[in-house]
């Protein structure tokens, strides 16, 4: 049961992380808490990739619920062997984990690109522009240049904070799904052969 317990632990963590990803992505649509920029299409192109909503969010809920379900005691066996069914379930969880890896990977890549390019903002010339796109992410180290964006208010801070959160959350999701790949492979091969004393406490 130890592999199932660990999977359940990972599953619950992923649900929380997925919800945080969705929330962070939604906030990107409302710079400074305002709706006008979304309606005027004055948002960074990478906001429209739905990396936190789809990649780190909805796509992550599928493996999360699969992992949570692995600890159920009424797991059906195959050919009358209950353990065989549990092994199959553990191995199938590897597929779910790979979906999670794809989703979290997408979230991480888009967040990194969003950070590197910087926000779409009304620049010092009065033009809606990717003011920091040519800096190759160097603007992140030079906060004195952030005032080049005159609108939305605090847009650089907003974008940097939320894309960084998405990057971190996606990274954690990626690691957890990777752990579950290993856990699932071990659980599938070894079966539920570990003793009752070897249970994970999560």
């Amino acid at each position: 049961m130890c592999y199932g317990k660990c999977a359940r632990c990972i599953g619950h963590s992923l649900v929380g992380l997925a919800l945080l990803c969705i929330a962070a992505n939604i906030l990107l649509y409302f710079p400074n808490g305002e709706t006008k920029y979304a309606s005027e299409n004055h948002l960074s192109r990478f906001v429209w990739f739905f990396s936190g909503i789809v990649g780190g969010g909805l796509l992550m809920l599928l493996p999360a619920f699969v992992f949570i379900g692995l600890e159920q005691d009424d797991c059906c066996g195959c050919c009358g062997h209950e353990n065989c069914g549990k092994r199959c379930a553990m191995l199938s969880s590897v597929l779910a984990a790979l979906i999670g890896i794809a989703g979290s990977g997408y979230c991480v890549i888009v967040a990194a690109l969003g950070l590197a390019e910087g926000p779409l903002c009304l620049d010092s010339l009065g033009q809606w522009n990717y003011t920091f796109a040519s800096t190759e992410g160097q603007y992140l180290l030079d906060t004195s240049t952030w005032s080049e964006c005159t609108e939305p208010k605090h847009i650089v801070e907003w974008n940097v904070s939320l894309f960084s959160i998405l990057l971190a959350l996606g990274g954690i999701e990626f690691i957890l799904c990777l752990i579950q790949v290993i856990n699932g492979v071990l659980g599938g091969i070894c079966g539920f052969c570990c003793s009752h004393q070897q249970q994970y406490d999560c």
């Epitope: 009304l122 010339l125 009065g126 033009q127 964006c149 609108e151």
Partner: antibody, heavy 120, light 106 residues
């Protein structure tokens, strides 16, 4: 009618400060920026900077940084430009101008101008 | 900063004649605006984005050009057109104006 009405002429001593006001009417104040341009007697036009009236974020020309402050009061649709440490070469007519954002950026509505004379 | 050089500094013409004003940029720019200023008055926008006529401006005014060379043309001068004309660039900060071309009655 769309218009910008500026405060009256000022006479200041070198080292003093001047604050020029610019009241907008006939349009939504926060939909446009306000730029400040000055013109010394018999000379051309010089851009001083501009302020985003929606966010209050100003952008100053390098020549005026540290000496100029641009602010707005959205409740009265008024923009302000304060110039400190005045010198005799700051004697000029100061214009506030409505600034259209976008791919084509232009100054379509000008205030009547405020003459600031710096003399000891 | 991008320096704009206007030529000629003074243009002496008669009403009804065609006026061609030049504005040359130190380096390539996207667009320019043209303004007209009469003595004791604030400048007035004539042309924006190189070739677009501002609201309320007569069709005898037209703008053209690209890169470094831009032109304002007044097809047939009216008495009220005698004034100083400025070009202005907005491709980079600081925004700069040309030195002006004075169109005077010959």
């Amino acid at each position: 009618e769309v218009q910008l009405v500026q405060s009256g002429a000022e006479v200041k001593k070198p080292g003093a400060s001047v604050k020029v006001s610019c009241k907008a009417s006939g349009y939504t104040f926060t939909n446009y920026g306000v730029k400040w341009v000055r013109q010394a007697p018999g000379q051309g036009l010089e851009w001083m900077g501009w302020i985003n009236t929606y966010t209050g974020n100003p952008i100053y020309a390098a020549d005026f940084k540290g000496r100029v402050t641009m602010t707005t009061d959205t409740s009265t649709s008024t923009a302000y430009m304060e110039l400190r440490s005045l010198r005799s070469d700051d004697t000029a007519v100061y214009y506030c101008v409505r600034f259209q954002y976008g791919d084509y950026r232009y100054f379509d509505v000008w205030g009547q101008g405020t003459l600031v004379t710096v003399s000891s | 900063e991008i320096v704009l050089t206007q030529s000629p500094a003074t243009l002496s013409l008669s009403p009804g004649e065609r006026a061609t004003l030049s504005c040359r940029a130190q380096s390539g720019i996207s667009f320019i605006n043209w303004y007209q200023q009469k003595p004791g008055q604030a400048p007035r926008l004539l042309i924006y984005g190189t070739a677009n006529l501002a609201s309320g401006i007569p069709a005898r005014f037209s703008g053209s050009g690209s890169g470094r060379d831009f032109t304002l043309t007044i097809s047939s001068l009216e008495p009220e057109d005698f004034a100083v004309y400025y070009c202005q660039q907005y491709s980079s900060n600081p925004l700069t104006f040309g030195g002006g071309t004075k169109v005077e009655i010959k």
